[in-house]
Interface confidence: low
């Protein structure tokens, strides 16, 4: 692994893909989507120290600024780098449809 | 505004871009950058409140996440959704040369 | 190569209004701020304004009559209301870099405009 | 706004003679200024960038210094393609101040 993968904080802690195991109603969806009725939400969590999976020149400056002033500026923080796909079965006036959703589902993280 | 560009919480305490002056020193590039010496790097701060600025179905999803399962999931948070563009004039063997970096100063914001 | 040709100056009655171009080639205009500069005959540079990535600055005695614009590839000056004394050498002027400081480093040649009845 | 001064308005050298001309800012502008050479009929063409740094292609005998309120730009050793009008430009627009240019300083052959 590159050295912005290895997590200083120990194992797990910082930025990484988690699933959440979610219903429809959890996300609020019961009202227009049938299906599927439960959901593997992937979801970007954990910390992000310094170097650890900087997305950009933008996370390196923010990094450095928030070291300099941690009340004005927040540390950069753990968000989708992209996106899987998913289907949802969605209830219309006159049935169903299949609607994709481009961004919906984290596929892997980065810090922002 | 859109109903999104409504801060709850108070004027200017939501996700929106900021302005911060900062030396190359404070941004640890002394270095390797000549010039310029001092940047107003513009980023992404604030809270991000239901339904504001939401970039995506994701972040509507993690938002919803977090209020049920808030020591788990976090809220989303504020992050650029486009960049400007910025040279610098950096330091090589041989003398200066100018680099632009497409994602340094952040554009506009939105919550992830 | 990089290039800024300005076009569009001439002659013009006093009262009247006048668009410039400066086209810009070999980089793309939105990548960088731009500057109008004029030099009346004999006289020293003259600084009007500047387009950025989020609008427009002026000189202070610039602001009113003198508006800059870009599309995707011209950077325009109009100018309302000339008066005799906006006679001069009008330049666009590319900005080396942005964010704090904003010096001009390369330039077109320039387009005559005057103003006279 | 910002003022500009620059100082002499005119000089005459020699060859090989080592040349100074500053230019004062009318309020505290850090080291954001640039140097600027211009010759008969032809556009500024930039010589210094922040107050000290070279631009690029532009030869060491031109060199620039200051911060705040005074600076200087000076030719080490004049030859004579530096015979033309410098001016200084202030590029400090955080504030909205605009980027006013001093009135020049004509270098002419004694």
């Known amino acids: 692994a590159r050295n912005g993968d290895r997590c200083p904080l120990g194992p797990g802690r910082c930025c990484r893909l988690h699933t959440v195991h979610a219903s429809l109603e959890d996300l609020g969806w019961a009202d227009w989507v049938l299906s599927p009725r439960e959901v593997q939400v992937t979801m970007c969590i954990g910390a992000c120290p310094s170097q650890f999976r900087e997305a950009n020149m933008h996370a390196q400056i923010k990094m450095n600024l928030h070291r300099l002033k941690p009340d004005t500026v927040p540390a950069p923080c753990c968000v989708p780098a992209s996106y899987n796909p998913m289907v949802l079965i969605q209830k219309t006036d006159t049935g169903v449809s299949l609607q994709t959703y481009d961004d919906l589902l984290a596929k892997d993280c980065h810090c922002v | 505004a859109r109903n999104g560009d409504r801060c709850p919480l108070g004027p200017g305490r939501c996700c929106r871009l900021h302005t911060v002056h900062a030396s190359l020193e404070d941004l640890g590039w002394a270095d390797w950058v000549l010039s310029p010496r001092e940047v107003q790097v513009t980023m992404c701060i604030g809270a991000c409140p239901s339904q504001f600025r939401e970039a995506n179905m994701h972040a509507q999803i993690k938002m919803n996440l977090h209020r049920l399962k808030p020591d788990t999931v976090p809220a989303p948070c504020c992050v650029p959704a486009s960049y400007n563009p910025m040279v610098l004039i950096q330091k090589t063997d041989t003398g200066v040369s100018l680099q632009t970096y497409d994602d340094l100063l952040a554009k506009d914001c939105h919550c992830v | 190569e990089v290039q800024l040709v300005e076009s569009g100056g001439g002659l013009v009655k006093p009262g009247g209004s006048l668009r410039l171009s400066c086209a810009a080639s070999?980089?793309?205009?939105?990548?960088?701020?731009m500057s109008w500069v004029r030099q009346a005959p004999g006289k020293g540079l003259e600084w009007i304004g500047m387009?950025?990535?989020?609008g427009t600055t002026y000189a202070t005695w610039a602001k009113g009559r003198f508006t800059i614009s870009k599309d995707s590839s011209t950077v325009y000056l109009q100018i309302n209301s000339l008066k005799t004394e906006d006679t001069a050498v009008y330049f666009c002027?590319?900005?080396?870099?942005?964010?704090?400081?904003?010096?001009?480093?390369?330039w077109g040649q320039g387009t005559l405009v005057t103003v006279s009845s | 706004d910002i003022q500009m001064t620059q100082s002499p308005s005119s000089l005459s050298a020699s060859v090989g003679d080592r040349v100074t001309i500053t230019c004062q800012a009318s309020?505290?502008?850090?080291?954001?200024l640039s140097w600027y050479q211009q010759k008969p009929g032809k556009p500024p063409k930039a010589l210094i960038y922040?107050?000290?740094i070279l631009a690029s292609g532009v030869p060491s005998r031109f060199s620039g210094s200051g911060s705040g309120t005074d600076f200087t730009l000076t030719i080490s050793s004049l030859q004579p393609e530096d015979f033309a009008t410098y001016y200084c430009?202030?590029?400090?627009?955080?504030?909205?101040?605009?980027?006013?240019f001093g009135g020049g300083t004509k270098v002419e052959i004694k």
């Open positions: 002027a590319r900005v080396v870099y942005a964010g704090w400081t904003y010096p001009l480093g390369i």
């Open positions: 922040e107050a000290s």
């Open positions: 309020q505290s502008i850090s080291s954001v």
């Open positions: 387009i950025s990535f989020s």
């Open positions: 070999g980089f793309s205009l939105s990548n960088y701020y």
């Open positions: 430009q202030a590029n400090y627009d955080v504030y909205n101040y605009g980027n006013p």
